[in-house]
Amino acid sequence: YDFTNCDFQKIEADYLRTISKDLITYMSGTKSTDFNNTVSCSNRPHCLTEIQSLTFNPTPRCASLAKEMFARKTKATLALWCPGYSETQINATQAMKKARKSKVTTNKCLEQVSQLLGLWRRFIRTLLKKQ
């Protein structure tokens, strides 16, 4: 999916209002220095591309992020503010249903969410730079 035509301001508002709080809740008990951020993003479409991939693509070490509250809100936000996004996400919905079975928060999932927080923060910064 090409995120170029999204309403970035609306996505930022949704992130600041709800998604960020859910991410921070998920990370509760860990310090921001506990994990080393190894990925970043260049501009707003790039940030959303990587956020979408990291949130919904299961990885061998962390297969269950898609069922989390922040992931559901991310999906809803992208569907709302990115034209045509929801039509591209049928496979992602199947992945979420499969992932719903396990509820263990592993250290690797915490690390992945730490990376997500970094990508979201970069998204906000690139937005500020453009204004």
Epitope: N36, N37, T38, V39, S40, C41, S42, N43, P45, H46, T49, E50, S53, L54, N57, T59, P60, R61, Q112, Q115, K129
Partner: antibody, heavy 117, light 108 residues
Framework: QVQLQESGPGLVKPSETLSLTCAVS?????????WSWIRQPPGKGLEWIGY???????SYNPSLKSRVTISRDTSKNQFSLKLSSVTAADTAVYYC??????????WGQGTLVTVSS | EIVMTQSPATLSLSPGERATLSCRAS??????LAWYQQKPGQAPRLLIY???SRATGIPARFSGSGSGTDFTLTISSLEPEDFAVYYC??????????FGQGTKVEIK
């Protein structure tokens, strides 16, 4: 200390597919970062080809997108480049590199690929 | 596509002298700029990222500055091992990351 090592044929015929592999040691490619390919024609500058991230997202240079495939094999801790329909203009030293999806902090030593019949 | 233009193409200096290399972007890249050093027969090495942050293990004599379209790499006092080709790279315009054509720093 992460180390990257490119391997593959040094000579490819025009119209065929160039295939290279980058073996990574000292770091798991499924643990973090992105894993990228960059090339440098003899005596010329650098050109970014694309990357695959540790979680599987893939991004390509638009000028090469129609001909490029980057994939990975996490069990072997390596990633690969395929470039189809090559011409003499694809003759270059091909580098693999570790990236944070923005810039490139560790590089392989490079491998020269010549396209010639 | 953002075009990166480096100047001069060649810089002839003696060890101990100060080197000032320029990189100009065809449109603003904010501070999304990196500098690399490449010696003959070797891979490039990351020197500077985010326009002014030194990469791990890079000596303090290397410094970067600039924002927007104009950037500078300064080597305060050239060491014999600093004679090489230097490239700038913008990473503001995903998915079209581009490099400059390089500046060769040679011994005078």
């Amino acid at each position: 200390q992460v180390q990257l090592q490119e391997s593959g044929p040094g000579l490819v015929k025009p119209s065929e597919t160039l295939s290279l592999t980058c073996a990574v040691s000292g770091y798991s490619i499924s643990s973090g970062y992105g894993w990228s390919w960059i090339r440098q024609p003899p005596g010329k500058g650098l050109e970014w080809i694309g990357y695959i991230s540790y979680y599987g997202s893939i991004s390509y240079n638009p000028s090469l997108k129609s001909r490029v495939t980057i994939s990975r094999d996490t069990s072997k801790n390596q990633f690969s480049l395929k470039l189809s329909s090559v011409t003499a203009a694809d003759t270059a030293v091909y580098y693999c590199a570790r990236t944070n999806l923005l810039y490139f902090d560790s590089w392989g030593q490079g491998t020269l690929v010549t396209v010639s019949s | 596509e953002i075009v990166m233009t480096q100047s001069p193409a060649t810089l002839s200096l003696s060890p101990g002298e100060r080197a000032t290399l320029s990189c100009r972007a065809s449109q603003s890249v904010s501070n999304n700029l990196a500098w690399y050093q490449q010696k003959p027969g070797q891979a490039p090495r990351l020197l500077i990222y985010d326009a002014s942050s030194r990469a791990t293990g890079i000596p303090a004599r290397f410094s970067g500055s600039g924002s927007g379209t104009d950037f500078t790499l300064t080597i305060s006092s050239l060491e014999p091992e600093d004679f090489a080709v230097y490239y700038c790279q913008q990473y503001s315009d995903w998915p079209q990351y581009t490099f400059g054509q390089g500046t060769k720093v040679e011994i005078k």
